[in-house]
């Protein structure tokens, strides 16, 4: 198991990249002046205590920014949030911190990220550009849940 976060670049199938704007992650078309965030990804060290065959449980952070992606309920609905958190602190915890964990599933070049805390809810971006990342249960409809990962360094 890796003990160092892996920096990756993420874009969706429409070649939109993730950008941080006012502490919110949004997906925008890749252009010259756009600076996409680098995502840090690390596998949960307690993989044997999580569901098998759902994907690799990972924590997702923003490289160098001490911010991690997490899922929390707002009313009845799970929402995607950024929380100030050191990804290695999550990694080292004695139990999986499920609100910050995602099952990373790969099919060919496409990756999906399913919330561990809210099974059936996936990281998604609206089919329109310039929208915040969200969680959705609606696969392949108005939202894109398939992403491409490029390992950096």
């Amino acid at each position: 198991k890796s003990e160092m976060p892996q920096p990756v670049s993420i874009q969706d199938i429409n070649h939109r990249v993730w950008v941080l704007q006012d502490q919110i992650l949004i997906a925008v078309p890749r252009k010259d002046r756009v600076s996409p965030v680098t995502i840090s990804l690390i596998s949960c060290r307690h993989v044997e205590t999580l569901e098998k065959d759902r994907g690799n449980p990972i924590y997702l952070g923003l490289n160098g920014l001490n911010l991690c992606l997490m899922c929390a309920k707002a009313g009845d609905q799970p929402t995607l949030q950024l929380k100030e958190k050191d990804i290695m602190d999550l990694y080292n915890q004695p139990e999986p911190v499920k609100s910050f964990l995602f099952y990373h599933s790969q099919s060919g070049r496409n990756s999906t990220f399913e919330s561990v805390a809210f099974p059936g809810w996936f990281i998604a971006v609206s089919s329109e550009g310039g929208c915040p990342l969200i969680l959705t249960q609606e696969l392949g409809k108005a939202n894109t849940t398939d992403f491409g990962l490029t390992m950096l360094f």
């Epitope: 205590t49 915890q93 004695p94 139990e95 999986p96 911190v97």
Partner: antibody, heavy 121, light 109 residues
């Protein structure tokens, strides 16, 4: 309010099994981990194991692996500890405890009232 | 398997400061042991005080603080109150299991 309510005292003969229950209220057990700990008369606490009620996966102290079985029924928010091949030295108060992530860390924050299991011939 | 040792008993005067410690037979206690401290008052259920070495549980008074002290986990009560008379137990994490200590009986006298 958060509560863990355990089943009543049990008296068992050596070699028998016992099943203790822990009913949770005031929170969703799927959002936490439930642990079992015991305290023999005049002794400290001894960790037995834990369950992730959302998934059903368990962890046990190697000392109790094979004799302790932790299960859950999420429909009733109840966690069970079954202890087999009982010996007199298993006489203890058995506690369930919630291990909950809050802020930056996990806490053994809420505990059941304890269940006395007496093993005697 | 590691053995976790605590002072069997300690006494503190009301308003005084006392430090309870938690030693591991397997070497120095570190932040990777995620020390937890729980309290049991006479006739009451256990209640969590400290997690992750030095984080106070919600609602725990500020007079309770956790730290590492000379290779041991420590719980300090500053300005002890009569209601702090209780049994205190530490728990340490070792890779895939927890080990609890034998407990400290604290008397406020």
């Amino acid at each position: 309010q958060v509560q863990l309510v355990q089943s009543g005292a049990e008296v068992k003969k050596p070699g028998a099994s016992v099943k203790v229950s822990c009913k949770a209220s005031g929170f969703n057990i799927k959002d936490t981990y439930i642990h079992w700990v015991r305290q023999a008369p005049g002794q400290g606490l001894e960790w037995i194991g834990r369950i992730d009620p959302a998934i059903g996966t368990t962890r046990y102290d190697p000392k109790f692996q094979g004799r302790a079985t932790i299960t859950t029924d999420t429909s009733t928010s109840t966690v069970y500890l079954e202890f087999s091949s009982l010996r007199s030295e298993d006489t203890a108060v058995y506690y369930c405890a919630r291990l909950h992530y809050f802020g930056n860390n996990f806490f053994f924050d809420y505990w059941g009232q304890g269940t006395l299991v007496t093993v005697s011939s | 398997q590691a053995v976790v040792t605590q002072e069997p008993s300690l006494t503190v005067s009301p308003g005084g400061t006392v430090t309870l410690t938690c030693r591991s037979s397997s070497g120095a206690v570190t932040t990777s042991n995620y020390a937890n401290w729980v309290q049991q008052k006479p006739g009451q259920a256990f209640a969590g005080l400290i997690g992750g070495t030095n984080d106070r549980a919600p609602g725990v008074p500020a007079r309770f603080s956790g730290s590492l002290l000379g290779g041991k986990a420590a719980l300090t009560i500053s300005g002890a109150q009569p209601e702090d008379e209780a049994d205190y137990f530490c728990a340490l994490w070792f890779s895939n299991h927890w080990v609890f200590g034998g407990g400290t009986k604290l008397t406020v006298l």
